[in-house]
Interface confidence: low
């Protein structure tokens, strides 16, 4: 049976086997087409989600679709039901928490009272007073908290207590990529991890340990990517994996937070990378133990210079490393998180590509997660 499962796929009605390599090849080889059903699926970027959260204390903002203007949500008459609606609009299904925070001196959006209409947040029709002088600070999910804070050093062995959201994404029991838990159902990773194998069946996720292969594997229900853009082949290197069964969170299995839409990280901002990737650029071997390293944001202009990536780094990407080189992600780290710590840990980047590993002028290039929030929310909403 193991051999059969490894090399063949069973079609139903009538029952017969086809070679597994015919799965997800774009041809309907089973009469009912089930060989093309459980494949990596593409999902368009979709419409603008009309709610978002700002890095200013996770305050809620609402889009007025008529004018295209964003407004800050006033705390007046804001209810649990409105909080749930806001989070559902972003695709969350967990119970949110919210509180009032004072309008700050840098408030640059108009503040309006919020109401609900057809399960979407709307601005109240009148001119929107905000007598409380407070905004809504909203958290859709408890995320980004770990049991242990990493020490700031170069590269060292990591503990799952520090990075409980890190997962190993495996095909046929082999580690292929890293990934991050975003909520009980969803793992974030890179789209290029699935270029070779587009059938969902053989992909598994392992969570809750810092050692490769020492923890149970989780079945995957769906793998979703953005439509491939041949004009920018390195763009859109992001994927979401939906687990067959929701994770139970614990000290070693927890979600990381998505970034805020306005999370603009300036050059030299300290960040962290983790992975089981190759420890030497040419060959070497996969690390059995999770490794962590502190890096920093590298200016895109510097990253696109003539002696570096010569314009290949787009606005939907970011560079990170250390100016003198030597600390970088490598093969096998792909799909893992580039992380920033404010009050919580946020996944600001996804390990994507680079020339070599750890070169001084060619740092790691990461998918900028904030550029894809809208896509993530639309995928989650479609799957709610």
């Amino acid at each position: 049976k193991v051999i059969l499962d490894k090399y063949y796929f069973l079609c139903g009605q009538p029952l017969h086997f086809i070679p597994r390599k015919q799965l997800c090849d774009g041809e309907l080889d089973c009469p009912l087409g089930e060989d093309e059903e459980h494949c990596v699926k593409s999902f368009p970027e979709g419409p603008a989600v009309a709610v978002r959260l700002s890095k200013d204390r996770s305050t809620l903002q609402v889009l007025d679709s008529a004018t295209g203007n964003w407004f800050s949500a006033c705390f007046d008459n804001f209810t649990e039901a409105l909080a749930e609606t806001a989070c559902r609009q972003m695709g969350y299904s967990s119970k949110p928490t919210f509180r009032a925070v004072e309008i700050g001196p840098d408030q640059d959006l108009d503040v309006v009272e919020i109401t609900e209409n057809s399960q979407e947040l709307r601005m109240r029709n009148s001119s929107g007073p905000c007598l409380s002088g407070s905004l809504v600070s909203l958290h859709c999910l408890a995320c980004g908290k770990s049991l242990k804070t990493p020490r700031v050093v170069g590269v060292e062995e990591a503990s799952v207590d520090s990075w409980p959201w890190q997962v190993s994404i495996q095909y046929d029991k082999q580690h292929v990529c890293g990934g991050s838990i975003l909520d009980p159902h969803w793992v974030l990773t890179a789209a290029h991890c699935f270029r070779k194998h587009t059938d969902v069946f053989n992909w598994k996720v392992r969570a809750g340990s810092d050692k490769l292969g020492s923890f149970p594997s989780l079945a995957v229900a769906k793998i979703i990517i953005i439509e491939f853009n041949p004009m920018y082949p390195k763009d859109n290197d992001i994927a979401l994996m939906k687990l067959q069964f929701p994770l139970t969170f614990s000290g070693t299995v927890r979600p990381i937070c998505l970034p805020f839409f306005d999370e603009e990280l300036t050059p030299a901002t300290p960040l962290w990378i983790i992975g089981w990737g190759f420890t030497k650029q040419n060959g070497g071997k996969m690390s059995d133990i999770l490794l962590q390293a502190s890096v920093q944001v590298i200016d895109s202009t510097r990253c696109n210079a003539d002696d570096a990536y010569q314009g290949e780094v787009t606005e939907k990407m970011m560079c990170a490393g250390i100016p003198e080189g030597g600390v970088d992600t490598c093969q096998g780290d792909s799909g893992g998180p580039l992380m920033y710590q404010s009050d919580q840990w946020h996944v600001v980047g996804i390990v994507s590509w680079g020339y070599g590993c750890g070169g001084p002028s060619t740092p790691g290039v990461y998918t900028k997660v904030s550029a894809y929030l809208n896509w993530i929310y639309n995928v989650w909403k479609a799957e709610l």
């Epitope: 800050s72 006033c74 007046d76 008459n77 309008i103 700050g104 001196p105 408030q107 640059d108 959006l109 108009d110 503040v111 309006v112 009148s126 001119s127 929107g128 007073p129 905000c130 007598l131 409380s132 002088g133």
Partner: antibody, heavy 122, light 107 residues
């Protein structure tokens, strides 16, 4: 400290126009809506309208629509209220008043300008 | 437009008295109500916002209560500097409207 200083008293003939200024200081001018309220002698307070100093967007009370124009000059942190086709019943003290909280349209007015008396008389 | 009414229109009181002024809105305005004090020849001054929140710098003898359509301003112990006219104002919707005022003078 936050201060609103208005222009001096005016005497106008019926049918003329008056333009009252209100110079703001001590805070980020573009962040706070400014409203205009008037008070006829011995009478109560009457709201005329508001302006968003950042965008210049205005909203006027129906009663003054077509006769009032509110503008701002961000370079001098000044808002203006111009009332045209004056009649004797427009004789009043005109106040500019800033909203209490930044970014909010009207959560109570604080502070107020000292007021400008406009007398309309033939 | 939302109509605001105040009562009484005037009252005479002595220093140390407890004074209560009421304000009624023609429709439900939740807690979108502010109270102002105005002295002759001066601009109004914000005392209470959001029906019951005391504006900073305002003495604690002033308090506000109410929600919906009925609101109250209370001065727990009248001081000489409190003789003035008091206005309520709704900011629930545009146009902003004020009550006609309550004049508090010395008995």
């Amino acid at each position: 400290q936050v201060q609103l200083v208005q222009s001096g008293a005016e005497v106008k003939k019926p049918g003329a126009s008056v333009k009252v200024s209100c110079k703001a200081s001590g805070y980020t001018f573009i962040g706070y809506y400014m409203h205009w309220v008037r008070q006829a002698p011995g009478q109560g307070l009457e709201w005329m309208g508001r302006i968003n100093p950042n965008s210049g967007e205005t909203n006027y009370a129906q009663k003054f629509q077509g006769r009032v124009t509110m503008t701002r000059d961000t370079s001098t942190s000044t808002v203006y209220m111009e009332l045209s086709s004056l009649r004797s019943e427009d004789t009043a003290v005109y106040y500019c008043a800033r909203v209490r909280v930044r970014g909010v349209i009207h959560p109570g007015f604080d502070p107020w300008g000292q007021g400008t008396l406009v007398t309309v008389s033939s | 437009d939302i109509q605001m009414t105040q009562s009484p229109s005037s009252l005479s009181a002595s220093v140390g008295d407890r004074v209560t002024i009421t304000c009624q809105a023609s429709q439900d305005i939740s807690n979108y109500l502010n109270w102002y004090q105005q002295k002759p020849g001066k601009a109004p001054k914000l005392l209470i916002y959001a029906a019951s929140s005391l504006q900073s710098g305002v003495p604690s003898r002033f308090s506000g209560s109410g929600s919906g359509t009925d609101f109250t301003l209370t001065i727990s112990s009248l001081q000489p500097e409190d003789f003035a006219t008091y206005y309520c104002q709704q900011s629930y919707s545009t146009p902003v409207t004020f009550g006609p005022g309550t004049k508090v003078d010395i008995k």
